[in-house]
């Protein structure tokens, strides 16, 4: 008894096609081994016609394929343009030779039933409608008009002009005449199914003077479109169902062994497996819509169907479109964490991959929202201003050429938890999904800025310090000035990191920023952060308000993206050799973007270097103080 299973008998008609599904036991070996379809000869030998290794015999060239569906433990042999010569005994099987596990299938291809010479052929897709034209002579104008469907013995009424309708056609069949033309009647049948296919006769009048016309209606199932996508990439199903279903609810479902399970529909249903990574977008009034799925997984491979019906569920006799999605595990898209965890008040730095060949593409970050059909409003982008509600706490750092850009979100709250997408205006396959989880903070943040309520006085000197733990001793520290176009890193240099010492004083690891003299444009958000090369780490944010000496606090306003930056170590002597041009905030440079700035850092303010007990968070003993430039207005 073979563990392979399939149809024992298959019968079809010349010119038609068959799709033979063979089922195999669920084992890893079976999923990966060769699948074949062979024809049995009189000698008992079985000659391969097609196999999953890519072999295709001459007689099947251009008219057959074999597709393995490992997720369903099936493989399918599709054969088109059948002829009577295809009648015979076959085997579908598994194994390196045709003597492996197999199942016997008998295929019988019959001649097309002879159609009367005046037969009119209508070819329609499943779910669509057909209008059959039935001409008649004037003398039969007052007589009964009818359409019947031929069965083996008789012709079964579909509809007639006395409003008699076969139960199978109620609500689907209409008999009508157009205008004043009394020589033709029409029958429209909607929501066509496979079962409507066949021979029909339309008739006007009775007896020998009756007008008759033969009609052959062919109802075709849509051929699945094959889609090949990489693991972790995205796929868009473009569904075009036609104007007649423009106002119906739309759905995308995935066929499993038993049914077609709805993944998403326009009535708000969504499969939890696709949470955070799916959108359905109505395109226009012509019944067109698309479904986008990001972060493709191995288990997403399979047979998908889109359709339209008021229930938002698959319904026979309604138009559909189908796809076979293959997910290639050898992906060009790097394997990144799909879940990022943060704590309230803290920050996250999310590395977004993009196609390295498209380094000049525009980069975006959006938040997936599941309400309605799902949407992903852009929160930040290389040429998109940060959304107002994210003021001061969201920035995108582009790192041209290395295939990654970074999005930093700080001042986290539990409401920030959810799904976010990385996307560009280039290669759409590189859309990726990140789930952000935010837990309640249980300890102090790693980076702390003092003073916390920062109000600078116009014209005076103002210093803020960013305290960091010893575990960050080897990382680059930076300050940047936030604007709704990004966070422009201010020229800075951490002198302490290059010094040899035997201790790391937890209390005195700091990088400071001095504004001297304070101007109105200095008001706004500033970030203190750490990074290692192109990898960004934690950040913290502070809003610096600027007020006049004689007045109370001024209104909090975001500042100009090109505000001049002045950064200094506390009480560091002024180095006025840096020109204003060099000190403009450069869009997204590294902390050491300007060689001149590194060279101009002196070895001053020795007294600020910390020395204390040995020991640090990461087992290194090192003292570091930060030296920075300070610029005069």
């Amino acid at each position: 008894k073979s563990p392979i299973f399939g149809p024992q008998e298959v019968s079809s008609i010349e010119g038609d096609s068959v799709s033979i599904t063979c089922y195999y036991p669920d084992t890893s070996v079976n999923r990966h081994t060769r699948k074949y379809w062979c024809r049995q000869g009189a000698s008992g030998m079985c000659t391969t016609l097609i196999s999953s290794n890519g072999y295709l015999s001459k007689e099947y060239s251009g008219r057959a394929n074999l597709i393995n569906f490992p997720e369903n433990n099936t493989f399918v042999i599709n054969i088109e343009q059948l002829t009577q010569d295809d009648t015979g005994s076959y085997k579908c099987g598994l194994g390196t030779s045709n003597r492996g596990l197999s199942f016997d299938v008998s295929l019988e291809v019959s001649q097309v039933p002879e159609l009367p010479s005046d037969t009119h052929v209508y070819t329609k897709d499943i779910g669509r409608n057909v209008t059959i034209e039935c001409p008649f002579k004037r003398e039969n104008a007052p007589s009964k008009k009818s359409l019947c469907k031929k069965t083996n013995q008789s012709c079964e009424l579909v509809i007639d002009s006395t409003e008699k309708v076969n139960p199978s056609y109620i609500g689907r069949a209409k008999l009508f005449m157009k205008g004043t033309d009394l020589t033709v009647f029409y029958v429209n049948i909607s929501h066509l199914t496979h079962n409507d296919a066949g021979l029909y006769i339309c008739q006007a009048g009775e007896g020998p003077s009756a007008d008759k016309k033969n009609v052959d209606l062919q109802v075709l199932a849509p051929e699945p479109e094959l889609l090949y996508k990489d693991l972790r990439s995205s796929v868009t199903f473009e569904c075009d169902l036609g104007r007649e279903v423009a106002n119906e609810a739309k759905y995308l479902c995935r066929m499993n062994k038993e049914t077609c399970d709805v993944i998403i529909n326009t009535l708000g249903k969504r499969d939890p497996d696709f949470e955070g990574r799916i959108l359905i977008t109505p395109k226009d009034d012509n019944g067109r819509f698309s479904v986008l799925i990001t972060g493709l997984r191995k288990e997403d491979a399979g047979h998908y169907q889109c359709g339209a019906h008021s229930s938002g569920l698959p319904q026979e006799g309604w138009p559909i479109q189908t796809w076979q999605l293959f997910v290639n595990e050898e992906s060009t898209i790097p394997n990144r964490r799909s879940v990022v965890k943060g704590v309230t008040g803290g920050s996250v730095a999310i590395a977004c991959p993009y196609n390295p060949k498209e380094s000049s593409s525009l980069k975006y970050w959006c938040r997936w929202e599941g309400d309605g059909n799902g949407h992903c409003p852009v929160l930040v982008g290389t040429q998109a201003q940060v959304q107002e509600e994210y003021e001061g706490r969201l920035a995108l750092f582009d790192q041209p050429g290395n295939g990654t850009y970074t999005v930093i979100l700080n001042q986290l709250t539990t409401e920030d938890a959810g799904f976010y997408w990385c996307l560009t205006n280039g290669d759409s396959r590189w859309r990726t999904t990140i789930e952000l989880q935010v837990a309640e903070a249980t300890r102090e943040p790693n980076l702390e800025v003092t003073p916390q309520n920062a109000t600078a006085v116009l014209g005076e000197t103002f210093t803020v310090s960013c305290h960091y733990p010893c575990k960050f001793y080897s990382q680059e520290k930076y300050w940047c000035k936030w604007s709704n176009k990004g966070c422009h890193i201010l020229p800075s240099h951490d002198e302490g990191a290059r010094q040899s010492s035997v201790s790391c004083d937890q209390s005195s690891q700091l990088v400071s920023m001095t504004l001297n003299p304070v101007s109105k444009e200095d008001e706004g958000w500033y970030w203190c952060g750490v990074k290692q090369g192109q990898t960004y780490g934690e950040t913290t944010a502070i809003y610096i308000a600027v007020e006049e000496r004689t007045r109370g606090s001024s209104h909090v306003n975001p500042t100009d993206a090109n505000a001049r930056a002045k950064v200094a170590l506390e009480e560091e002597v002024v180095d006025s050799s840096i020109s204003e041009k060099e000190n403009k905030a450069i869009p997204n440079p590294g902390p050491f973007a300007n060689e001149r700035e590194i060279q101009n850092v002196g070895d001053q303010a020795q007294e600020n270097r910390a020395s204390g007990d040995a020991g640090s968070a990461d087992g290194q003993s090192r003292s570091s103080s930060s030296k920075h430039h300070h610029h005069h207005h």
Partner: nanobody, 127 residues
Amino acid sequence: EVQLVESGGGVVQAEDSLRLSCAASGLPFSSSRMGWFRQAPGKEREFVAAIGWSGRSTYKYYADSVKGRFTVSGDNAKKTLDLQMKDLKPEDTAVYYCAAHPDYYGDPRTSGAYRYWGQGTQVTVSS
């Protein structure tokens, strides 16, 4: 209301023949797959035979235990299903159920591949 009604069951001698029929009414579609299952006392429901229609092609499936003895046939448009049983054996004794599904996919041997079920008809084969 959807109804699948089986008929033709009865008591026969071993090696006799019997023909079961199933008529569907109230189905919102002409089925694309219909099948026969059976359940003997104290046993699981098991697949017997099925027929599937797609376009002008027909696909027939049989359980190993009935191959060569049972023949399934049906009319997709009329929503009828027949099972011609020959050379019956005592182990064929069971309640035979008719099942239908609007779609032509899913493993026909699994009961989950069918949406609608009949009440069953008893077949008893005495030795």
